[in-house]
Interface confidence: low
């Protein structure tokens, strides 16, 4: 009520001031009434402070500063070059899909899907990953064969209290091979790509854990897990990289109702990891060797390891029976890359970032969209770029390395006043020649201020125009790295800048 009264007073006082202005009242009188109006508005503002809108990004989202964007673009560049090197095409799909498209594809994670408010038309949801839209794209376009990559944002209603270091809007970088091929060749290439990218990014030692959904399901069957509990027990097993077996067992027994002896049998298997020798050992296992699914999975893994040796990455791969990635659509090989250590300063704890890339085979997903249930075998991987961004950012902060946020090659500066026209002409010439150039937006900037900006921005070169130089038809070109300064003829400037910045001929 008080606020409403105050708003009314402001309105009336405003009208009074406008009236005085229309009547051309004296300046003093108008000023006096304006002062009153401002005081009333200030009172209103204080009152407003109690319920003021807090300016922030929505929970689970963030802005990217130019510095962060520079890091991000470098990471994307490494990833895209690798995807292209392996012959991938690129696609894009809508940020939102029909709700029905995403329904029933993510198991327990479905509750994390963002549904859009119904506007009286289609029921829509924001995409949760890039894989389900890819499967929809294949089915819709009746494609049976494609190798594609897709880099885009996805949306998940993760509970921030439960999932630290995770966002509700984040990038995924996916590479997938769809088509009927001989077993394990595309799967091996996906693992090769994963290793190439993680090595190129130089974020530290990593290990890729490999398992197979069929081995897991076969193992659960021989251990006595009821079919209905396979998926929920899978999610418990998947926690073994973070907590002890004891805790996982407690969850399976206490929370999920599994018999303790069944849990113990699972424990005997899932605590094992190794290489191809473990695969061979399990093929001889009296129980597993009797399970058709498990034998199929183990046979494929044996073949996979042969290809991994040929690709020269077998030392980076570990067969790990506890790997049980949560998504419902995996049907065969599954894999997940984890960072083993993080280059930190002595005495600091290593950064625990968990999974940095993952993927697997999902042969049934496209069939879910096909009216006749026709299947398109698919295998793919996803690079956890958000985690990689934060590792790279932290590493750069620790090293205090300067990150350039622009690609400017040359700053056009002037040594004296009244040279704005000359700077504008020169910068325009450089732009037209495809040179990345900048100038300070002041008529008469001090040379010192220009040079300070040049150094702080990390621009490699500065072209300095002076009155004497103009008369002589030269430009002074100074290098930030060597501090040397040379006179370059105006007509040779573009070529000299290109030479010094190793830029091939290009124009806009």
């Amino acid at each position: 009520a008080d606020r409403a009264a105050l708003e009314e007073l402001v309105r009336l006082q405003g009208a009074h001031v406008r009236g005085l202005k229309e009547q051309k009242a004296s300046a003093e009188q108008i000023e006096e009434e304006v002062t009153k109006l401002l005081k009333l508005k200030a009172q209103l503002g204080q009152d407003e402070g109690k319920q003021k809108f807090v300016l922030k990004t929505p929970k689970g989202t963030r802005d990217y500063s130019p510095r962060q964007m520079a890091v991000r673009e470098k990471v994307f560049d490494v990833i895209i070059r690798c995807f292209k090197r392996h012959g991938a095409e690129v696609i894009d799909t809508p940020v939102f899909e029909l709700k029905e498209t995403l329904t029933g594809k993510y198991g327990e994670d479905s509750k994390l899907i963002y549904d859009l408010k119904d506007q009286g038309g289609e029921l829509l949801s924001l995409r949760y990953d890039l894989t389900v839209p890819f499967a929809r794209y294949l089915a819709m376009n009746k494609l049976t064969n494609i190798k594609r990559y897709h880099i885009a944002k996805v949306y998940r209603r993760d509970n921030p209290a439960m999932t630290r270091g995770r966002y509700r809007e984040f990038y995924q970088c996916d590479f997938d091979i769809a088509g009927q091929f001989d077993p394990m060749i595309p799967d091996a290439e996906c693992l090769k790509i994963m290793c190439e990218i993680l090595s190129s990014l130089q974020i530290g030692n990593f290990l890729v854990k490999v398992n197979d959904r069929r081995i897991l399901d076969g193992m659960f069957a021989v251990c006595g897990v009821p079919d209905s509990k396979f998926r929920t027990i899978c999610s418990s097993v998947d926690k073994l990289d973070k907590v002890s077996w004891e805790e996982v067992k407690n969850e399976m027994v206490g929370e999920k109702g599994l018999a303790p002896e069944v849990a113990d049998r699972i424990g005997d298997y899932v605590q094992q990891h190794g290489g191809v020798s473990l695969v061979e050992q399990l093929l001889q296992d009296p129980k597993l060797s009797q399970n058709k699914q498990a034998v199929e999975g183990l046979g494929d893994l044996k073949l996979l390891f042969e290809y991994l040796i040929l690709f020269g990455i077998d030392d980076k791969i570990s067969f790990d029976l506890s790997l049980a990635r949560g998504l419902d659509y995996y049907t065969g090989v599954i894999y997940e890359a984890v960072l083993l250590q993080m280059p930190t300063q002595a005495g600091e704890e290593p950064l625990g970032v968990g999974s940095i890339a993952a993927g697997g085979r999902y042969d049934g997903l496209v069939g879910m969209f096909d009216p006749k249930g026709r299947k398109v075998p698919c295998v793919g991987l996803s690079i956890g770029v958000e985690r990689i961004f934060s590792i790279v950012e932290q590493r750069l902060e620790a090293s205090e390395e300067k990150v350039r946020t622009t690609e400017t090659q040359v700053l056009v500066a002037s040594a004296q006043k009244k040279l704005l026209e000359e700077r504008l002409k020169l910068v325009s010439e450089l732009w037209d020649a495809g040179i990345k150039a900048e100038l300070l937006y002041k008529k008469n900037p001090k040379l010192l201020n220009q040079l300070q900006y040049w150094e702080e921005a990390g621009i490699p070169l500065v072209a300095i125009i002076g009155e004497q130089e103009l008369r002589d038809g030269v430009i002074k070109l100074r290098s930030v790295a060597s501090r040397e300064e040379v006179d370059v003829r105006r007509e040779d400037l573009v070529e000299e800048i290109r030479r010094r910045t190793n830029q091939p001929l290009s124009t806009c």
Epitope: R62, P160, A161, M162, R164, G165, K242, V243, G254, E348
Partner: antibody, heavy 122, light 110 residues
Framework: QVQLVQSGAEVKKPGASVKVSCKAS????????IGWIRQAPGQGLEWMGD????????NDNEKFKDRATMTADTSTSTAYMELSSLRSEDTAVYYC???????????????WGQGTLVTVSS | DIVMTQSPDSLAVSLGERATINCQSQ?????????MHWYQQKPGQPPKLLIK???NLESGVPDRFSGSGSGTDFTLTISSLQAEDVATYYC?????????FGGGTKVEIK
């Protein structure tokens, strides 16, 4: 070893604001959340909210949503809790505590600060 | 909010005897699973985590302390009370925001 050191006792008038700090050491500040819990004289514990410095998430107890602001400065590994429009019933010891984060299970609080007594009196 | 009801409010037990504290959560959902934690608070000190997730003993806590229960009913047991166990004990759930605490149980020596 993990330590949370809080700022000293404060005496405030009704309507004023108070800002309590909590400096963390002995672990990677951005890997864990910091919760704020208060305890009125002779009373039990009341959770006010938490902040996760690694991603600047805050979780708020609706009861304090309009008055409590939780922030964190990662450069100094310090968390802050500011409570505005103080009233006499806000007189309490305010604790910060580290959220024990484990496999995305909900939090227990494994390390606590020594507490900051805030007295609100006219 | 989930209401946590702790009982009894206070408890006097002879040295070496068993002390049992109960905590019941009136949860909106059917169950709070085992997201229940127990703290010990001595006068003038901050609370100290004893047991997390209903039954997991925090490192450095004597094994005379144990926790049990699931669903909505949880128990903290001190198998053989020692003089240094005189304190107020609180349960806390972390099933949904806001986390809430029980009212506390004051344990004294008889």
């Amino acid at each position: 070893q993990v330590q949370l050191v809080q700022s000293g006792a404060e005496v405030k008038k009704p309507g004023a604001s108070v800002k309590v700090s909590c400096k963390a050491s002995g672990y990677t500040f951005t890997d864990y959340c910091i919760g704020w819990i208060r305890q009125a004289p002779g009373q039990g514990l009341e959770w006010m909210g938490d902040i996760c410095p690694g991603d600047t998430y805050t979780n708020d107890n609706e009861k304090f949503k309009d008055r409590a602001t939780m922030t964190a400065d990662t450069s100094t590994s310090t968390a802050y809790m500011e409570l505005s429009s103080l009233r006499s019933e806000d007189t309490a010891v305010y604790y910060c505590a580290r959220g024990e984060e484990q496999l995305g299970l909900r939090n227990a609080m494994d390390y606590w600060g020594q507490g900051t007594l805030v007295t609100v009196s006219s | 909010d989930i209401v946590m009801t702790q009982s009894p409010d206070s408890l006097a037990v002879s040295l070496g005897e068993r002390a049992t504290i109960n905590c019941q959560s009136q949860s909106v959902s059917t169950s709070t699973y085992n997201y229940m934690h127990w703290y010990q608070q001595k006068p003038g000190q901050p609370p100290k985590l004893l047991i997390k997730y209903a039954s997991n003993l925090e490192s450095g806590v004597p094994d005379r302390f144990s926790g049990s229960g699931s669903g909505t009913d949880f128990t903290l047991t001190i198998s053989s009370l020692q003089a240094e166990d005189v304190a107020t004990y609180y349960c806390q759930h972390s099933w949904e925001i806001p986390w809430t605490f029980g009212g506390g149980t004051k344990v004294e020596i008889k």
